[in-house]
Interface confidence: medium
């Protein structure tokens, strides 16, 4: 027990001596951040002269500064042991380690090339002032349907499947929150919806078979005799678009 | 100062269902395309899903049908649905931010919520 | 399907080392440059270190780069710090879905 005791203290002098003889060789050490070592001033701690500043300890000199000028703006304001940092003024947005440049924002719809900004090529969309276009989501994957088309700025909304969208289908809700077991307000309203209908489409038969003007009837048939139709993804302006320089647009715009 | 921090982890039982929250403070989520990415023990990171700054939501193959992502702008908030949960869904859940300057690198990350299904 | 190989899956280095680790991916990544690379420590989340296969994010030292375009890779830590020793990870976005996909991961050990 005492020789560990021992070498506690032991170790504790060693320490606490080395670091007095470091303190002696290297007067340097003992600067702290926000001061240098003045070599001629018989290696004193100075304080960092402004504009400057010493992050660490120990240093022999001071870094200048960062400036955050023309297209940079002032996000921290330098002080002795740390350096400015800058942000982008608006219309811009930081780019690289530390915000070394500013790059363009863009509207959405577009995103930013070599050649500035550059509408979204059909088929993708930006609904963001910065980054880049993103292909559509392909609702066919999921086995549904496309429901609302795609834009440049907005992507397309996914509906159920071709399957489900039969022309008595309901449209596309989102799930309502559950309820507790019993007649729902819910229920109710869709027995009403479908007995309305269910009453509606007998009348429409009845007014139809009593019909006399038989041009209207074959409209009538032409109505029901198309197919149903899924949206489709219409064409866009294609002018400018990012994707018509495959080589100089990081790989364009291939899907 | 900006972060993210994910709860509602814990245990759960096989066939059970758990639901991840992803809160934000010092940034707007609503501005960001927001991920939720997994770390089984041991494993590597495996991409769960993403919902985009406008509600476009994507699933990696694996989360399709199971998880599902949702957002709460007035929140600030990103939540991540888990049903019908397996062993093998064991992991640290993490919510990520996408790069300001890319939209496909998370440059800010939650500290994670570890999920345990177990019996 | 997507797939993202990384290689080595480890690697013995000592500090002062050069470093480098290579991902292949199949297909191309979007744009041809829509990979980033990642550093995760044990019990911490990842922390990006590249985004758009080659540009630094803000903070992270000089010795990283990155390198490639479209299906080929690589991260170089040009001088091995004691800080360095983790676990990296590239990952790569996809047009398909706007998937993304993570490589297996290579843990850098001291030697």
């Known amino acids: 027990m005492g020789n560990s005791c021992y070498n506690i203290v032991a170790t504790l002098l060693l320490v606490l001596n080395f670091e007095r003889t470091r303190s002696l060789q290297d007067p340097c050490s003992n600067c702290p951040a926000g001061t240098f070592c003045d070599n001629n001033r018989n290696q004193i701690c100075s304080p960092c002269p402004p504009n400057s500043f010493s992050s660490a300890g120990g240093q022999r000199t001071c870094d200048i500064c960062r400036q955050c000028k023309g297209v940079f703006r002032t996000r921290k304001e330098c002080s002795s042991t740390s350096n400015a940092e800058c942000d982008c003024t608006p219309g811009f947005h930081c780019l690289g380690a530390g915000c070394s440049m500013c790059e363009q924002d863009c509207k959405q719809g577009q995103e930013l090339t070599k050649k500035g900004c550059k509408d979204c090529c059909f088929g993708t969309f930006n609904d963001q002032k910065r980054g880049i276009c993103r292909p559509w989501t392909n609702c066919s994957l999921d086995g549904k349907s496309v429901l609302v088309n795609g834009t440049k700025e907005r992507d397309v909304v996914c509906g159920p499947s071709p399957a489900d969208l039969s022309p008595g289908a309901s449209s596309v809700t989102p799930p309502a929150p559950a309820r507790e077991p019993g007649h729902s307000p819910q229920i109710i309203s869709f027995f009403l919806a479908l007995t309305s209908t269910a009453l509606l489409f007998l009348l429409f038969f009845l007014t139809l078979r009593f019909s006399v003007v038989k041009r209207g009837r074959k409209k009538l048939l032409y109505i029901f005799k198309q197919p149903f139709m899924r949206p489709v993804q219409t064409t866009q302006e294609e002018d400018g678009c990012s994707c018509r320089f495959p080589e100089e647009e990081e790989g364009g715009c291939e899907l | 100062e900006v972060q993210l921090v994910e709860s509602g982890g814990g245990l759960v039982q096989p066939g059970g269902s758990l639901r991840l929250s992803c809160t934000a403070s010092?940034?707007?989520?609503?501005?960001?395309?927001m991920s939720w990415v997994r770390q089984a023990p041991g494993k590597g990171l495996e991409y769960i899903g993403m919902?985009?700054?406008?509600?476009?939501?994507h699933y990696a193959n694996s989360a399709k049908g199971r998880f599902t992502i949702s957002k709460d702008n007035t929140k600030n908030t990103v939540d991540l649905q888990m049903n019908s949960l397996r062993a093998e869904d064991t992991a640290v859940y993490y919510c990520?931010?996408?790069?300001?300057?890319?939209?496909?690198?998370?440059?800010?990350w939650g500290q994670g919520t570890l999920v345990t299904v177990s019996s | 399907d997507i797939q993202m190989t990384q290689s080595p899956s480890s690697v013995s280095a000592s500090v002062g080392d050069r470093v480098t680790i290579t991902c292949q991916s199949s297909?191309?990544?979007?744009?041809?440059?829509?990979l980033a690379w990642y550093q995760q420590k044990p019990g911490k989340a990842p922390k990006l270190l590249i985004y758009?296969?080659?540009t630094l994010a803000s903070g992270v030292p000089s010795r990283f780069s990155g390198s490639g375009s479209g299906t080929d890779f690589t991260l170089t830590i040009s001088s091995l710090q004691p800080e360095d020793f983790a676990t990296y990870y590239c990952?790569?976005?996809?047009?398909?879905?706007?998937?993304?996909?993570f490589g297996g991961g290579t843990k850098v050990e001291i030697k």
């Open positions: 297909p191309s990544v979007y744009k041809n440059n829509q």
């Open positions: 919902i985009g700054s406008s509600g476009t939501i």
């Open positions: 990952a790569g976005g996809y047009s398909s879905s706007s998937d993304t996909a």
């Open positions: 990520a931010r996408d790069s300001y300057n890319s939209d496909y690198a998370f440059n800010l």
């Open positions: 758009l296969a080659s």
């Open positions: 010092g940034i707007d989520l609503s501005a960001y395309h």
